[in-house]
C-alpha cells in the first residue's frame, strides 16, 4: 500500500522521497515566505483502516510573507513568489526540535497549476492562490479527479495536454 501524490499547500512545495506507508515528508515554504510559528510542515503517509486506503496527513503549515524579504523582492499582484527558503526550526510532537529544513531549488514568480480534465486541452490562466488546494486521495487512477482549487482555468484549443489521472498537489530536496 502506498500513498497518492501529496496535496498542495499554498506557497510551499514538497518533493516526496518515499510514497510508502508511514513515510514522513516535509513541505518547505517558498522564497519570500516563512513558516508561521506554531504550524508544522510535516506530513505522514497513514492508513485509513476503515477504507484500507493510504493518504497523506494534512499539515498545519501556513507559509506567510517574510517581512525581511519584502523590500528586496516585492511580489507583483497575482503572482506567487518562490525559491530559496529561510529554514526555521519547528517543534516535534511531544518534545524536541525539528531540524531546519534545507532550501528547495525553487525560484520566484507566477505560480500556475495544471487543470485536470482527462482528455482535454487545457491552458492554465494565472491568478492568485487563495488557499490550500487539497485533492481527494481516494480516487481511482483513471477516474475524473475531484479537485477543489482556487485557480481559474480556461479551455483553449492549443494548450498543453493533461494526461488523465489523479492530480493531488505538493518541496524538493536536492540530491
Amino acid at each position: 500500500i502506498t500513498c497518492p501524490p501529496p496535496m498542495s499547500v499554498e506557497h510551499a512545495d514538497i518533493w516526496v522521497k518515499s510514497y510508502s506507508l508511514y513515510s514522513r515528508e516535509r513541505y518547505i515554504c517558498n522564497s519570500g515566505f516563512k513558516r508561521k510559528a506554531g504550524t508544522s510542515s510535516l506530513t505522514e503517509c497513514v492508513l485509513n483502516k476503515a477504507t484500507n486506503v493510504a493518504h497523506w496527513t494534512t499539515p498545519s503549515l501556513k507559509c506567510i510573507r517574510d517581512p525581511a524579504l519584502v523590500h528586496q523582492r516585492p511580489a507583483p499582484p497575482s503572482t506567487v513568489t518562490t525559491a530559496g527558503v529561510t529554514p526555521q526550526p519547528e517543534s516535534l510532537s511531544p518534545s524536541g526540535k525539528e531540524p531546519a529544513a534545507s532550501s528547495p531549488s525553487s525560484n520566484n514568480t507566477a505560480a500556475t497549476t495544471a487543470a485536470i480534465v482527462p482528455g482535454s486541452q487545457l491552458m492554465p490562466s494565472k491568478s492568485p492562490s487563495t488557499g490550500t488546494t487539497e485533492i481527494s486521495s481516494h480516487e481511482s487512477s483513471h477516474g475524473t479527479p475531484s479537485q477543489t482549487t482556487a485557480k481559474n482555468w480556461e479551455l483553449t484549443a492549443s494548450a498543453s495536454h493533461q494526461p488523465p489521472g489523479v492530480y493531488p498537489q505538493g518541496h524538493s530536496d536536492t540530491t
Epitope: P5, N107, T113, Y167, P168, T174
Partner: nanobody, 124 residues
Framework: EVQLVESGGGLVQAGGSLRLSCAAS????????IGWFRQAPGKEREGVAC????????HYVDSVKGRFTISSDSADNTVYLQMNSLKPEDTAVYYC?????????????????WGQGTQVTVSS
C-alpha cells in the same frame, strides 16, 4: 503551441537500460522545473525525478536513486531520464511535465504542461 513529447520507452529485460527523452516545443526550458512521473496500472502517479534548469538541482524518489539520472540539454530543449538496472516494478507509463518559474514538486497539479507519456515495460 506548447508541447512536451516523450520518447525512448520500450520493452527491456530486468537489469537493462533505457533512456527517455522529453522534448519541448513552443517554449524554452530557461526557468522551468521538468519532472518525470510514472503511473503503473492500477496505481497512483508518482514523481520519479525532477530537474530545475535554472540551477541544475535534481531530485529523485528513493526507489530510483542510484539507478536513474535526470539531465537537461538546453541546446536542444530536451530533458533526459537515463534508467539503469531496471526492475519489473519500474514498468509504467512515464510522463514528463513542466512547471514555469517554480521548483520541483511532487504535486501533480502544480505542473503547467504534460506530455502524452511513453510506455516502459521491464520483463523478468
Amino acid at each position: 503551441e506548447v508541447q512536451l513529447v516523450e520518447s525512448g520507452g520500450g520493452l527491456v529485460q530486468a537489469g537493462g537500460s533505457l533512456r527517455l527523452s522529453c522534448a519541448a516545443s513552443g517554449f524554452t526550458f530557461d526557468d522551468y522545473a521538468i519532472g518525470w512521473f510514472r503511473q503503473a496500472p492500477g496505481k497512483e502517479r508518482e514523481g520519479v525525478a525532477c530537474i530545475r534548469n535554472s540551477d541544475g538541482s535534481t531530485h529523485y524518489v528513493d526507489s530510483v536513486k542510484g539507478r536513474f539520472t535526470i539531465s537537461s540539454d538546453s541546446a536542444d530543449n530536451t530533458v533526459y531520464l537515463q534508467m539503469n538496472s531496471l526492475k519489473p516494478e519500474d514498468t509504467a507509463v512515464y510522463y514528463c511535465a513542466a512547471r514555469v518559474r517554480l521548483g520541483c514538486t511532487s504535486v501533480l497539479a502544480a505542473y503547467d504542461y504534460w506530455g502524452q507519456g511513453t510506455q516502459v515495460t521491464v520483463s523478468s
